[in-house]
């Protein structure tokens, strides 16, 4: 009766917890200080309860600990006597996803803290461009990724349908292709990939730029700049300059934002201007012969984008060549 | 956790311009967009456009082109939008907006700004 | 612009039923994959709070008795069972191209 009267019951608290797939995290619980702390924390499913971690006289007891949990959690054992029951939880993985109750009893007070654990996981997705026959396809790839993404798709500012989706990974995490057919298309096209539970987006972007005609021996410039909605300047980015032929790219130029370093595949290929604002990447190709035609793709990537320039380049013979011939 | 913390009401005379703050805390400010929404007394929502904090980028409602402008301080993880040539009609409560990068909704909302302009 | 119309413009609901509230769109809204369509709802003296993104995601934290459904120009958010806490006014937003718009709010009452 004496106890009863001091012994308090909080009822539950309950708030949403988001890690990342393989990482760490931390299950928050907090209570009022008091002597011969209890700690239980358990996770629970639609059929079981498990447990995860418990503490009590003075130690971590682990002896009933689910397999599951083995070498994966610990609790700030220096701060419970402040109150800190907060759980420390080892590369998370989507199994671990659930309800996880915190039990904390002490001499005066009893307390349930309810923790959901939710994880995501969002690798860096990719647009890519490629040739099949005569048809043109966009691809936007995410390799990874937790829960299903949305896969945004717009032409020229609308959105639009895909054409085809292709998914691995029944359960998660999963892997996601999806494609638009651009055959003919001069429209410019995004796609966004948004993981909503992470709260993050990635966006790819495809611009075709007019084509241009040029004469053997001539120079061409070719355009490419970061739009100014997309990049910051303190966002670490490559720039890779390539061209398409047959369905097959081949590198001309290569540029990391991080180092400030250029590497060339092709010696008539050379930066229009220096790059000192790090926001125009054209190049120049000097020197054009008859087999320079074709399709060159600027490619400025970060984590966040990928913007894709392609631009159609027609070498046509000199007039002294052609009178030649 | 995420907080939008918008600054106090403000009174204005008819003509007169105000600006208004929204500051950031509990995420990375440069990673999201804020946007800007109106609400006037007893009447629904008009959104009026946003800023990418990261390149100061802005996108307006054309309905607010001439009226509204918006700025950010990276450094202080504060976004402003200030309302110029103010009338009766921008009586309302100012709302700013978290929002994913590339996706038009808005997750996280701040307090509000009244404003009242009366002469 | 597109203009979101909500309907009906309030209800009042008892407690533990369904409330069921209709966006409908001037133009469709949505391509095969996604409705470009969002709820919020608004109690008195706060500002909104985000529920459903693209017409049937529920944000995070957000009760399950919240769910929405729909394409094309209609969409639909339902509450069931309804409880106390959820009186306040119910906003739609399309993102389908600038500008943004919302519908004109229904209030919900619980009887």
């Known amino acids: 009766i004496f106890l009863s009267a001091f012994f308090t019951y909080v009822p539950m608290n309950e708030q949403i917890i988001i890690g990342r797939l393989g990482e760490d995290i931390i299950l928050p619980s907090s209570f009022e200080r008091g002597s011969e702390v209890v700690i239980h924390w358990k996770y629970q499913d639609s059929y079981n309860s498990y447990n995860v971690h418990s503490y009590y006289k003075g130690s971590g007891r682990l002896e009933s600990q689910d397999t599951r949990y083995a070498n994966r959690t610990s609790l700030f054992y220096n701060e419970i006597q402040n109150g800190n029951a907060s759980l420390f939880f080892r590369r998370l993985s989507l199994l671990d996803e659930g309800i996880y109750t915190c039990y904390v009893g002490t001499a005066i007070q009893a307390i349930t803290n309810k923790v959901v654990l939710k994880v995501g996981v969002f690798l860096t997705p990719m647009m890519k461009y490629e040739k099949r026959n005569t048809n043109s396809f966009l691809i936007c790839n995410v390799l990874s990724v937790y829960p299903r993404p949305i896969i945004t798709w717009k032409m020229d500012n609308t959105p639009i349908s895909e054409n085809n989706m292709q998914e691995t990974g029944s359960l998660g995490p999963f892997s996601i292709n999806s494609t638009l057919n651009i055959t003919g298309s001069n429209s410019s096209y995004e796609c966004t990939i948004e993981n909503s539970l992470l709260k993050q987006t990635w966006t790819g972007r495809w611009t075709m730029k007019d084509g241009l005609h040029k004469m053997q021996s001539e120079h061409v410039s070719l355009s490419c700049e970061l739009v100014n909605d997309y990049f910051s300047p303190n966002q670490d980015f490559k720039v890779t300059w390539s061209r398409m032929e047959s369905g097959i790219s081949s590198i001309l130029a290569y540029y990391l934002s991080s180092s400030q370093n250029t590497t060339f595949y092709e010696s008539r290929f050379s930066w229009n201007k220096e790059l000192k604002n790090q926001s125009d990447f054209s190049m120049n190709l000097t020197d054009l012969s008859l087999s320079d035609s074709g399709e060159y793709l600027c490619n400025i990537s970060s984590d966040e984008y990928t913007l894709l320039t392609i631009h159609t380049v027609h070498v046509e013979p000199s007039q002294e060549t052609a009178s030649d011939n | 956790q995420v907080q939008l913390q918008q600054s106090g009401a403000e009174l204005a005379k008819p003509g007169a311009s105000v600006k208004m703050s929204c500051k950031a805390s509990?995420?990375?400010?440069?990673?999201?967009?804020i946007h800007w929404i109106k609400q006037r007394p007893g009447q629904g929502l008009e959104w009026i456009g946003y800023?990418?904090?990261?390149?100061?980028?802005?996108e307006y409602n054309q309905k607010f082109k001439d009226k509204a402008t918006f700025t950010a301080d990276k450094s202080s993880s504060t976004a402003y939008m200030q309302l110029s040539s103010l009338t009766s009609e921008d009586s309302a409560v100012f709302y700013c907006?978290?929002?994913?990068?590339?996706?038009?909704?808005?997750?996280?909302w701040g307090q509000g700004t009244t404003l009242t302009v009366s002469s | 612009d597109i203009v979101l119309t909500q309907s009906p413009a309030s209800l009042a609901v008892s407690l533990g039923l369904r409330a069921t509230i209709s966006c409908r769109s001037s133009?469709?809204?949505?391509?095969?994959?996604?409705?470009?369509m969002h709820w919020y709802q608004q109690k008195p003296g706060q500002p909104p709070k985000l529920l459903i993104m693209?017409?049937?995601n529920l944000e995070s934290g957000v009760p399950a008795r919240f769910s929405g459904s729909g394409s094309g120009t209609d969409f639909t958010l339902n509450i069931h069972p309804v409880d106390e806490e959820d009186t306040a006014t119910y906003y739609c937003?399309?993102?389908?191209?600038?500008?943004?718009?919302f519908g004109g709010g229904t209030k919900l009452e619980i009887k």
């Open positions: 800023i990418i904090p990261n390149t100061d980028y802005t």
């Open positions: 907006a978290r929002g994913l990068r590339g996706a038009y909704y808005f997750d996280y």
């Open positions: 937003q399309h993102s389908w191209v600038l500008p943004y718009t």
């Open positions: 509990g995420y990375t400010f440069t990673s999201f967009w």
């Open positions: 693209y017409a049937s």
């Open positions: 133009q469709s809204v949505s391509t095969s994959t996604n409705g470009y």
